[in-house]
């Protein structure tokens, strides 16, 4: 979380933005608040890329200002205008690029005063893995997909039984560049797994953590997966 | 101390290639945008071309689209001017300039390098 | 593409006047506007940036004014270091111009 406060003449308002993460070819969201004002047409929004010659957004009384846009962003950036009285300045980024990453700065004048705060993106590719049993094996096999990442993941397997054990001898994990040639799938395969035992594989990169679950006993198959972002820092 | 130094200039014939480097030092490079500035002899300054911070956007004076190139390497702190179907009148001193860290925040064009001549003759 | 136009593109004048340059954009640039002083063999400094913003170690006798299409330099007064070539450049969003420079010699 970053608090930024900024200096009118006699007044300052406080502008909170959080660091947040961007799945390449999704849209992505630009977290920023402020105090609010009473009159929209009031309020300025301005986002800001570090190093960057245009505007990233400008929204002034009430409506999008795009004159001053960089090329970059042309067509991709909207703010939630309806939010904008409560004090969300957010931005939706649409189509994340790998090159979205960077500094930003949600920067707000109101009648109140002025006010800023950077936020640190970061783009990549992360998706949720899905563990299954792989039939066509010669002995029981487990197969972890993950359909999109980057950068360049780790991948760890774990059980629940063997906790600390070291599968790394025992599994084989590729990756396959996908068609747009930047984020790949990720196969990761167990061998000589044992039933009635929960294992796990675990991605991760420096965007996203991502888990998959598979329990196996002889009645049934239970499957669980969560993906958390790593870098969700406010500011 | 901030630094810059051009190089890679020369005389090549018309329709030739050439790329010029940028080394920078003594500031966070991928901070700020750099810019390519050129004075042909005895005329005016020339904006050229810009990239942003992360190389993501690059921008072109009419006279070069098509036929520059800029582009940067964060790693190496530096920037780069593939020049391509070269003419008489590209013929200048070529500067690079640390351009805009914040738009409409911060100072631009507040540091520049030596310069390398470009000439462009048969 | 933005143009930028000087005037007057040379000026002669004496140690002690006060010199004013002005520079006309041919759509408004709001205050997106610097100016730079060049001396012979040697690359452009940043005097002037946003309109009226002193960069930081340059003379208080520099001064810049104006928005939107008119702008002005004024050297309230000249010394003998500052006989040189001027220019204005406009960076509204993502383009770079140049004017085509003003010449200030010795009367």
């Known amino acids: 979380l970053i608090i930024g406060f900024g200096i009118s003449g006699r007044h300052s308002i406080t502008v909170t933005t959080v660091a947040s993460a961007g799945n390449i070819g999704e849209d992505g969201i630009l977290s920023c608040t402020f105090e609010p004002d009473i009159k929209l047409s009031d309020i300025v929004i301005q986002w800001l890329k570090e190093g960057v010659l245009g505007l990233v957004h400008e929204f002034k009384e009430g409506k999008d200002e795009l004159s001053e846009q960089d090329e970059m962003f042309r067509g991709r950036t909207a703010v939630f205008a309806d939010q904008v009285i409560v004090g969300n300045a957010s931005l939706r980024l649409k189509n994340v690029q790998l090159t979205d990453a960077g500094t930003y700065k949600c920067y707000i004048i109101t009648s109140k005063g002025k006010g800023n705060a950077n936020l640190e993106y970061k783009t990549g590719a992360f998706s949720m893995p899905e563990v299954n049993v792989d039939y066509n094996a010669s002995s029981e096999t487990l197969r972890c997909e993950a359909p999109r990442w980057f950068p360049q993941p780790t991948v760890v397997w774990a059980s629940q039984v063997d906790q600390g054990a070291n599968f790394s001898e025992v599994s084989n994990t590729s990756f396959e560049l996908n068609s747009e040639n930047v984020t790949m799938k990720v196969v990761s395969v167990l061998y000589n797994v044992t039933i009635n035992n929960t294992y796990s594989c675990m991605i991760e990169n420096d965007i996203a953590k991502a888990t998959g679950d598979i329990k196996v006993t002889e009645s049934e198959i239970k499957r669980r997966s969560h993906l958390q972002l790593l870098n969700s820092k406010a500011s | 101390e901030v630094q810059l130094l051009e190089s890679g200039g020369g005389l090549v014939q018309p329709g030739g290639s050439l790329r010029l480097s940028c080394a920078a030092s003594?500031?966070?490079?991928?901070?700020?945008?750099m810019s390519w500035v050129r004075q042909a002899p005895g005329k005016g300054l020339e904006w050229v071309s810009a990239i942003s911070g992360g190389g993501g956007s690059t921008y072109y004076a009419d006279s070069v689209k098509g036929r520059f190139t800029i582009s940067r390497d964060n790693s190496k702190n530096t920037l780069y001017l593939q020049m391509n179907s070269l003419r008489a009148e590209d013929t200048a001193v070529y500067y690079c300039?640390?351009?805009?860290?914040?738009?409409?925040?911060?100072?631009?064009?507040?540091?520049w390098g030596q310069g390398t001549l470009v000439t462009v003759s048969s | 593409d933005i143009q930028l136009t000087q005037s007057p593109s040379t000026l002669s004048a004496s140690v002690g006047d006060r010199v004013t340059i002005t520079c006309r954009a041919s759509?408004?640039?709001?205050?997106?506007l610097a100016w730079f002083q060049q001396k012979p063999g040697k690359a452009p400094k940043l005097l002037i940036y946003?309109?009226?913003s002193l960069e930081g170690g340059v003379p208080s006798r520099f001064s810049g004014s104006g928005s939107g299409t008119e702008f002005t330099l004024t050297i309230s007064s000249l010394q003998p270091d500052d006989f040189a070539t001027y220019y204005c450049q406009q960076y509204n969003s993502y383009s770079r111009t140049f004017g085509q420079g003003t010449k200030v010699e010795i009367k």
């Open positions: 300039a640390r351009d805009i860290q914040w738009f409409g925040e911060s100072t631009l064009f507040d540091y």
């Open positions: 759509q408004s640039i709001r205050s997106w």
């Open positions: 003594g500031f966070t490079f991928s901070s700020y945008a």
């Open positions: 946003k309109a009226s």
